[in-house]
């Protein structure tokens, strides 16, 4: 069904980092336009990137009121020019993305190590607390704020002289490990949510050594 | 040092809503702690009803979660319980927890190192 | 869920004598994540280890645990009669949270 020169939206992709999320879809438009609407499973719908000739629209501002929240959204197909026109049914054609939430789903973005401080045979190595663009009373929220312990990190260290490579973990965003004196340490950072079953693990974060910038080093 | 304090109602009505408070003491319910609700059924173990950061993000026992609210208002240094739907099988002593980490292997782990002294609450009309 | 069971259920011995509690995970728990708790009658439970084998701030050294995997021991070296109490695991790594049934560690 639908107006002889439309078309319907296809691969209906969300692609969500640390709650910034994007709907994209296909095809690039010929003689047509676009219009988005996302709702929650118990809401209305609302339009959003009206009449627009981009295949992509930001939802970020819509998921973020509540990140628990189970989500809807669907692209309309109208003809350039001729917004009004509808499909044989009466109504225009539109294609249904699959169901998102933002808690479950949202990748991990890549994390960074914030600071690593020696003091004599201990470092202790802090991750920035990414904020997100979750807010709650006027402010945002970082990562740890909205996944609390759900979220762990893994710490990679190794000597800079060898290639073996030794992990800890942590339910907040501070490792203390013991090293060797004398010795300069890499580090590298993964953040994990081990209840997830899909999208557990973020990229690993730059590669912070002993004896560059970001160290402290105290006796 | 941290004390903890729960208060509210100690008889709900069957099909009521169950409504605790705990008060902290001593410290700031911002600093990076988790706060809990367990509770102990007469002469039983105990139960973990669920948690909640500074910030709202909570996380709850499944066996429960429909039925259980908790939230924080930093400005007074509370936390709150609501169970709503109560039957007889509510009846228990209630406890507030402050979860702190802990550094152990390289990371920091949360435990439950200061309770509040609990506080009966019976259903029953 | 874990499924924590805690054997003896009730364990009778004099001051001074050894105590040995078991605790064991329905699957695997990381060490991390296992604490014991010691309650005594009307008060509320007290935190005595954590990462299975650490001691709290001011517990003393003859409470010790051990461990690993899904089996777990809580040790009191020389029972003080201010140790007869009730025991409890708890997993804090899987939600929900649980805890084992408890050990009644009681005077001969």
């Known amino acids: 069904s639908g107006t002889t020169n439309t078309v319907a939206a296809y691969n209906l992709t969300w692609k969500s980092t640390n709650f910034k999320t994007i709907l994209e879809w296909e095809p690039k438009p010929v003689n047509q336009v676009y219009t988005v609407q996302i709702s929650t499973k118990s809401g209305d719908w609302k339009s959003k990137c009206f009449y627009t000739t981009d295949t992509e629209c930001d939802l970020t501002d819509e998921i973020v009121k509540d990140v628990k929240q189970t989500y809807l959204a669907r692209v309309f197909s109208y003809p350039a020019g001729n917004v009004e026109s509808t499909g044989s049914a009466g109504e225009p054609l539109f294609t249904n993305a699959r169901k998102f939430l933002p808690y479950r789903d949202t990748k991990l973005g890549q994390p960074t190590i914030q600071s690593f401080e020696q003091v004599g045979t201990k470092v202790n190595v802090t991750v920035e607390d990414e904020r997100t663009l979750v807010r709650r009373n006027n402010t945002f929220l970082s990562l740890r704020d909205v996944f609390g312990k759900d979220l762990i990190y893994t710490l990679y260290y190794w000597k800079s002289s060898s290639s073996g490579k030794k992990t800890a973990k942590t339910n907040t965003n501070e490792f203390l490990i013991d090293v060797d004196k004398g010795e300069n340490y890499c580090f590298s950072v993964q953040a994990v949510i081990p209840s997830r079953t899909v999208n557990r693990k973020s990229t690993d974060s730059p590669v912070e050594c002993m004896g560059q910038e970001k160290g402290e080093f105290r006796e | 040092q941290v004390q903890l304090q729960e208060s509210g109602p100690g008889l709900v009505k069957p099909s009521q809503t169950l409504s605790l408070t705990c008060t902290v003491s001593?410290?700031?319910?911002?600093?990076?702690?988790?706060w809990s609700w367990i509770r102990q059924h007469p002469g039983k173990g105990l139960e973990w009803i669920g948690e909640?950061?500074?910030?709202?993000?909570?996380r709850y026992n499944p066996s429960l979660k429909s039925r259980v609210t908790i939230s924080v208002d930093t400005s007074k240094n509370q936390f709150s319980l609501k169970l709503s739907s109560v039957t007889a099988a509510d009846t228990a002593v209630y406890y507030c927890?402050?979860?702190?980490?802990?550094?152990?292997?390289?990371?920091?782990?949360?435990?439950?190192?200061?309770w509040g002294k609990g506080t009966t609450v019976t259903v029953s009309s | 869920e874990i499924v924590l069971t805690q054997s003896p259920g009730t364990l009778s011995l004099s001051p001074g004598e050894r105590a040995t509690l078991s605790c064991r995970a329905s699957?695997?728990?990381?060490?991390?994540?296992l604490a014991w708790y010691q309650q005594k009658p009307g008060q509320a439970p007290r935190l005595l280890i954590y990462?299975?084998?650490s001691r709290a701030t001011g517990i003393p050294d003859r409470f010790s645990g051990s461990g690993s995997g899904t089996d777990f021991t809580l040790t009191i070296s020389r029972l003080e009669p201010e140790d007869f109490a009730v025991y409890y695991c708890?997993?804090?790594?899987?939600?929900?949270?649980?805890f084992g049934g408890g050990t009644k560690v009681e005077i001969k």
């Open positions: 927890a402050r979860d702190t980490p802990y550094y152990y292997d390289g990371g920091y782990y949360y435990y439950m190192d200061v």
């Open positions: 001593g410290g700031s319910i911002s600093s990076g702690q988790y």
């Open positions: 909640i950061y500074y910030s709202g993000s909570t």
């Open positions: 699957q695997s728990v990381s060490s991390s994540y």
């Open positions: 990462g299975a084998s």
């Open positions: 708890q997993q804090v790594g899987v939600v929900p949270y649980t």
